[in-house]
């Protein structure tokens, strides 16, 4: 990825930004992401083992969309979380979360998206991840399932 | 809360931004938008025949919401796409997409929204559009159905 | 449309930003928000009686998510609004709104989110609020229900 310049401060610096898209070879949590091909962006932020690693403290808008679908609805509870991990806290911190229950008609083919987005004060070395409850129900098309952020 | 510095450009320049709202005389795809009245914004970006035309290469946050509703649910599959067209690609590029299937109880009055938003590296002369699968099921209230972007 | 200047500061100034999270002692409309503890942000914007008060005219990205859930679905219509009030207009202005009808199977435990986010030109002294139709169906976890903005 080439870096993208942010508006014109004295020295041209990389705009901290990421847009990662669904990767269908995710086998476990957290989700893994495509960080190289397609409509992907990665500049001034690092991608490491499913996570976006912050390298400059500041305010970030963080977002994610997950597209769930299935052949035959059984209304399994769905959850979609963006969470943060760092060395200072033993526990993961859930930043944003969406849950769905009783969302389709039993037996029918179904599809539904969950979108999350908000502003957070992130610290250098924070790691951000996305978790879902039912990996087998996620569709990983690049336009449908994604994870991103940018520094304000 | 500690304060966070905003970016420091020397010269006052137009912020590239758009927020267009639903226009009920949309008769075909892509959707048409209100670009003049109400809570509309259009600055440093051109609106032309349904599309937002980029005139400066850079990083943009692009978003859209569509409000679908009907008098009697028959669970027609719904889709909501933000796509891009330019001279370099013969094909439209779907940037973001939401799909819904089996989302309401047959025969009942129903309503549902789809929200999309993400960061993209756009090039001068790219044109962005919004497409839906079922035009007759879209409600075009300005607070409910909209399309916008801003340059980071 | 008049063009909107992007931020010009020579001096490092507070980034105008807010991220407020759900507060379970909300008893009436508009919703009340947690403005002190947890993953809350409040800088260069004031929180007053459920509302975010703008103190500098300009372009803002405004967002909110509300998490609705219930023990036994009866498909009460749900609405989620971000609206604006100021001294110049007698009427509230609905900026963004989401509605849901016929969204779950009668009698079942259910859960659903509504997300809104867009850009608006706000004026100093504008007050922004969030309204929902069914307060008793809102879950106020900080990761699930929130309200925020930042100045572009």
């Amino acid at each position: 990825q080439i870096g993208h310049p942010s508006p014109p401060p004295e020295k041209k610096e990389l705009r901290k930004v990421a847009h990662l898209t669904g990767k269908s070879n995710s086998r476990s949590m957290p989700l893994e992401w495509e960080d190289t091909y397609g409509i992907v962006l990665l500049s001034g932020v690092k991608y490491k083992k499913g996570g976006l690693v912050i390298n400059e403290t500041g305010l970030y808008f963080v977002y994610s969309k997950v597209y769930f679908r299935g052949q035959s609805c059984n209304n399994l509870p769905l959850s979609h979380k963006v969470y943060m991990r760092n060395s200072k806290y033993p526990q993961d911190l859930v930043m944003m979360e969406g849950k769905m229950m009783s969302y389709c008609t039993t037996g029918q083919m179904w599809a539904r998206s969950s979108y999350l987005g908000a502003v957070f004060n992130l610290t250098s070395a924070d790691h951000l991840y996305v978790n879902v409850s039912e990996l087998s129900l996620v569709n990983f098309e690049e336009s449908q399932t994604f994870f991103g952020l940018y520094k304000l | 809360q500690i304060g966070h510095p905003s970016p420091p450009p020397e010269k006052k320049e137009l912020r590239k931004v758009a927020h267009l709202t639903g226009k009920s005389n949309s008769r075909s795809m892509p959707l048409e938008w209100e670009d003049t009245y109400g809570i509309v914004l259009l600055s440093g970006v051109k609106y032309k025949k349904g599309g937002l035309v980029i005139n400066e290469t850079g990083l943009y946050f692009v978003y859209s919401k569509v409000y679908f509703r009907g008098q009697s649910c028959n669970n027609l599959p719904l889709s909501h796409k933000v796509y891009m067209r330019n001279s370099k690609y013969p094909q439209d590029l779907v940037m973001m997409e939401g799909k819904m299937m089996s989302y309401c109880t047959t025969g009942q009055m129903w309503a549902r929204s789809s929200y999309l938003g993400a960061v993209f590296n756009l090039t001068s002369a790219d044109h962005l559009y919004v497409n839906v699968s079922e035009l007759s099921l879209v409600n075009f209230e300005e607070s409910q159905t909209f399309f916008g972007l801003y340059k980071l | 449309q008049i063009g909107h200047p992007s931020p010009p500061p020579e001096k490092k100034e507070l980034r105008k930003v807010a991220h407020l999270t759900g507060k379970s002692n909300s008893r009436s409309m508009p919703l009340e928000w947690e403005d002190t503890y947890g993953i809350v942000l409040l800088s260069g914007v004031k929180y007053k009686k459920g509302g975010l008060v703008i103190n500098e005219t300009g372009l803002y990205f405004v967002y909110s998510k509300v998490y609705f859930r219930g023990q036994s679905c009866n498909n009460l219509p749900l609405s989620h609004k971000v609206y604006m009030r100021n001294s110049k207009y007698p009427q509230d202005l609905v900026m963004m709104e989401g509605k849901m009808m016929s969204y779950c199977t009668t009698g079942q435990m259910w859960a659903r989110s509504s997300y809104l986010g867009a850009v608006f030109n706000l004026t100093s002294a504008d007050h922004l609020y969030v309204n929902v139709s069914e307060l008793s169906l809102v879950n106020f976890e900080e990761s699930q229900t929130f309200f925020g903005l930042y100045k572009l």
């Epitope: - | 075909s28 048409e32 032309k48 025949k49 349904g50 035309v53 005139n55 044109h127 | -």
Partner: antibody, heavy 117, light 109 residues
């Protein structure tokens, strides 16, 4: 006025660049410069337009790929055509239209392209 | 997007009236983005009507455009010999797509 040039007799498979030159004015804001063609004894067929404000380009679905419209200067618009076939034999017109609605106000006299072996 | 001019040729006497129809496969932009052109042999087309019903400058008021959405009509009244020509409709659509109708020849007797 507008004037087209570059029309010629060419062999199938060849490429050609047509030029549209404005005299007495330059392409003004809010207008598109377009190419339209007309095969002998046939109707008009829209090919492509370019927005004079930002060089955004718009093509007929059948024209994508083989036809390229560009604006090298404020008074010149080009149309490049590749892999020419006999079906491309036509008079090629350039015309200006308002960007917000179709109104091809000003037309050039046309330039003839003949594709034959 | 397909524009269909149902009649390939119409004829009428001097002083009479002719009506030319143009049907679009989908609604034109803002329901009125349709124009009409007159073309004579070995000449480029000339704009007559734009936005469905607005008369282009210098065009006599004998030419009248009407219609909305997908159905449009050009009416030429008080027909003159000089009106003998081929008439084309053109539609503008969202995404800045244009299309021409197949043309209708007007023969003045």
């Amino acid at each position: 006025s507008l004037e087209e040039s570059g029309g010629d007799l060419v062999k199938p498979g060849a490429s050609l660049t047509l030029t549209c030159t404005a005299s007495g004015f330059s392409f003004s804001s809010g207008y598109d410069m377009c190419w339209v063609r007309q095969a002998p004894g046939k109707g008009l067929e829209w090919i492509a337009c370019i927005d004079t404000d930002n060089d955004a380009t718009y093509y007929a679905s059948w024209a994508k790929g083989r036809f390229t419209i560009s604006k090298p200067s404020s008074t010149t618009v080009l149309l490049q055509i590749t892999s020419l076939t006999a079906a491309d034999t036509a008079t090629y017109f350039c015309a200006t239209t308002h960007g917000d609605y179709v109104a091809f106000k000003l037309w050039g006299p046309g330039t003839l392209v003949t594709v034959s072996s | 997007q397909v524009l269909t001019q149902t009649a390939s040729s119409v004829s009428a006497a001097v002083g009479g009236t002719v009506t030319i129809n143009c049907q679009s496969s989908q609604s034109v932009y803002k329901n009125n983005d349709l124009s009409w052109y007159q073309q004579k042999p070995r000449q480029p087309p000339k704009l007559l009507i734009y936005q469905a019903s607005k008369l282009a400058s210098g065009v006599p008021s004998r030419f009248k455009g009407s219609g909305s959405g997908t159905q449009f009509t050009l009416t030429i009244g008080d027909l003159e010999c000089d009106d003998g020509a081929t008439y084309y409709c053109a539609g503008g659509y969202t995404a800045s797509i244009y299309a021409f109708g197949g043309g209708t020849e007007v023969v003045v007797k």
